[in-house]
Amino acid sequence: ECVTQLLKDTCFEGGDITTVFTPSAKYCQVVCTYHPRCLLFTFTAESPSEDPTRWFTCVLKDSVTETLPRVNRTAAISGYSFKQCSHQISACNKDIYVDLDMKGINYNSSVAKSAQECQERCTDDVHCHFFTYATRQFPSLEHRNICLLKHTQTGTPTRITKLDKVVSGFSLKSCALSNLACIRDIFPNTVFADSNIDSVMAPDAFVCGRICTHHPGCLFFTFFSQEWPKESQRNLCLLKTSESGLPSTRIKKSKALSGFSLQSCRHSIPVFCHSSFYHDTDFLGEELDIVAAKSHEACQKLCTNAVRCQFFTYTPAQASCNEGKGKCYLKLSSNGSPTKILHGRGGISGYTLRLCKMDNECTTKIKPRIVGGTASVRGEWPWQVTLHTTSPTQRHLCGGSIIGNQWILTAAHCFYGVESPKILRVYSGILNQSEIKEDTSFFGVQEIIIHDQYKMAESGYDIALLKLETTVNYTDSQRPICLPSKGDRNVIYTDCWVTGWGYRKLRDKIQNTLQKAKIPLVTNEECQKRYRGHKITHKMICAGYREGGKDACKGDSGGPLSCKHNEVWHLVGITSWGEGCAQRERPGVYTNVVEYVDWILEKTQAV
């Protein structure tokens, strides 16, 4: 059962796992949610009746029954983790805490103009978990405007104290706001020989990399595969760090794989969700329950629905006993990973999918692409929407993309002459325009947010957000597309598609079925040569065939330029302007979405 509200002046008795310090009860709840075992917590607020050394303590708790006895206690705030909830969860915390000093290892001290600048510095520093900033009103003259970057083993403060005229806050890496590079490569036959901060068991290097990503101190990792010569180290995932933030030594070793934390890409890559099955593999751990199940998929479902289950091993039924049902062993451990991994015993193992909701919905795998042809099939581009205007009569106006459950990203130039959001309708999950009838359900638009620097498409800033009146329930035919990570600026996308109903303002001919065209990206330098009378800025991206031959008119204004990278689709561009429809195949010019990620997040995450 999902309980989101906090219980004031209430303390849960017993069940303690560990104590951390957090600046608020709300953040304590987030920490509990992300902890592998925490189901409940008790936070102590500052209060004259409480011992100041207990202020800001966040006690993480577990219980076999998923609840604990409640005791009345002033200044105590208790609650439940969001593990029991089905909604999307985020660790992003933009709050600034006034007059609080969050203690940790102060590894960097520098002057900053503002707390915001200090927070940006922390976000763009590989080691930084949180910061404290002494304002210009701080009593000690030499400490004024000093920005202290801090880290700890847990990622949370070691203590929090009251201190006048300082402010503290957390790194915004988990808000997808870091400019740090996103290195997704996994290097085979490589060992990173730096200090280990932790080690866990993992079935493959990908799971190891994901564990590294959500471990607060891990910057890179080395994984020893099941063929590693030293038996005791097989399936061992070593979580590592270094002062420079990069591996100091790389050693060539067969059957080892190494890689980096994906903390700068976590907005657009699954880091919590381990969805694969591991055949002929047994995960060892504390046994929670043994139940009968028809298949390993059914076993995974049982594990996902059991809030304390972290991983499972399924042993298929022997011959025809037990109505063809096998045994499903639901398991857990202190850190969420198996205590040992064994091979050759015939089991099928995997992880709970409960953590998938901690990843962005946009990372969910969609139907395989239909190769060939120009007409799309249902569910092929589930983020594509058709934006209609109802004035003077109803018609398709522009394309757009679902980027959140209340947000559509599109082009600013679509709203020339649109006086009010009331005349707009957003239809999602549509393949053919002919499906749209008077009774077809749609999303009303609450607000049109146009970039305030937008003047005309050709000058850039051709980007707009639509805030919907109601939220989109994600299904196979309507779900979001990931925004590119700022750390992915240097990625060379090779699998890019433009989609739309083929409508451009000048040509009123519109296709009934959603069209698609695979088009290569063109460098801005090359693009500039093709558009000598227009400035192609770094905030634009170009795509199209050098020799023509592809109808770039398939893309609607405002619609997506979608690129697949590492099995995840990213919204790389928004169809903006260009001469792709005429005989002269110039590349199409698209709004370069990665350059607007801050703007998008600022607008969509505004309180």
């Epitope: 093709r530 000598r532 009378g533 400035k535 001469e579």
Partner: antibody
């Protein structure tokens, strides 16, 4: 009908500057690019640069980059090309032309040309 | 920069005969090739754009062909008023560049 009318002939001394105007009529001035092309006596055509009257964006040929300035005044639908530090080999007929397409392309309408003579 | 090489430099053709002017680009220019006619004391006049499209008001004896790097302007039946200098131009990549011109005369 579309017309581009250029200013009259100029005689200049080496080192001086010349500013040629090009007044457009018969179409929406800000919707098409204005290109400047010159032709030395008995020679071929040489592209000097382009101005986008809508945005004011300019793009110059590397050969002229440090000497040419193109501007426009949208209120009177006029484009200007100024060439500084004139040399004797700048003696030529200077043409303004409109592009056929909004984003560039062939030049479908040309001014009558302005003869600039550089002589000491 | 893309170099447009025109040939021949000059050409004499009898009235009513076919005249052919060639233009070779130093690299592929897709279909972004135009042809102009210039008579003495006048500005150039657009004849053909996108390799083969006749501009408004241009007689149908003028035609363009080619692809990639090799392009041709053909006048199927030469008329007296066709005496002029003809230029090709690529618009594929900035800066746009012109051929050196072909002077067409009557034999």
């Amino acid at each position: 009908q579309v017309q581009l009318v250029q200013s009259g002939a100029e005689v200049k001394k080496p080192g001086a500057s010349v500013k040629v105007s090009c007044k457009a009529s018969g179409y929406t001035f800000t919707n098409y690019l204005i290109e400047w092309v010159r032709q030395a006596p008995g020679q071929g055509l040489e592209w000097m640069g382009v101005i986008n009257p809508g945005s004011g964006y300019t793009n110059y040929n590397e050969n002229f980059k440090d000497r040419v300035t193109m501007t426009r005044d949208t209120s009177i639908s006029t484009a200007y090309m100024e060439l500084s530090r004139l040399r004797s080999d700048d003696t030529a007929v200077y043409y303004c032309a409109r592009t056929y397409g909004k984003y560039g392309g062939a030049m479908d309408f040309w001014g009558q040309g302005t003869t600039v003579t550089v002589s000491s | 920069d893309i170099v447009m090489t025109q040939s021949p430099d000059s050409l004499a053709v009898s009235l009513g005969e076919r005249a052919t002017i060639n233009c070779k680009a130093s690299q592929s220019v897709s279909n972004d090739v135009a042809w102009y006619q210039q008579k003495p004391g006048q500005p150039p006049k657009l004849l053909i754009y996108y390799i083969s499209n006749r501009y408004t008001g241009v007689p149908d004896r003028f035609s363009g062909s080619g692809s990639g790097t090799d392009f041709t302007l053909t006048i199927s039946s030469l008329q007296a008023e066709d005496v002029a200098v003809y230029f090709c131009q690529q618009d594929y990549s900035s800066p746009p560049t012109f051929g050196g011109g072909t002077k067409l005369e009557i034999k």
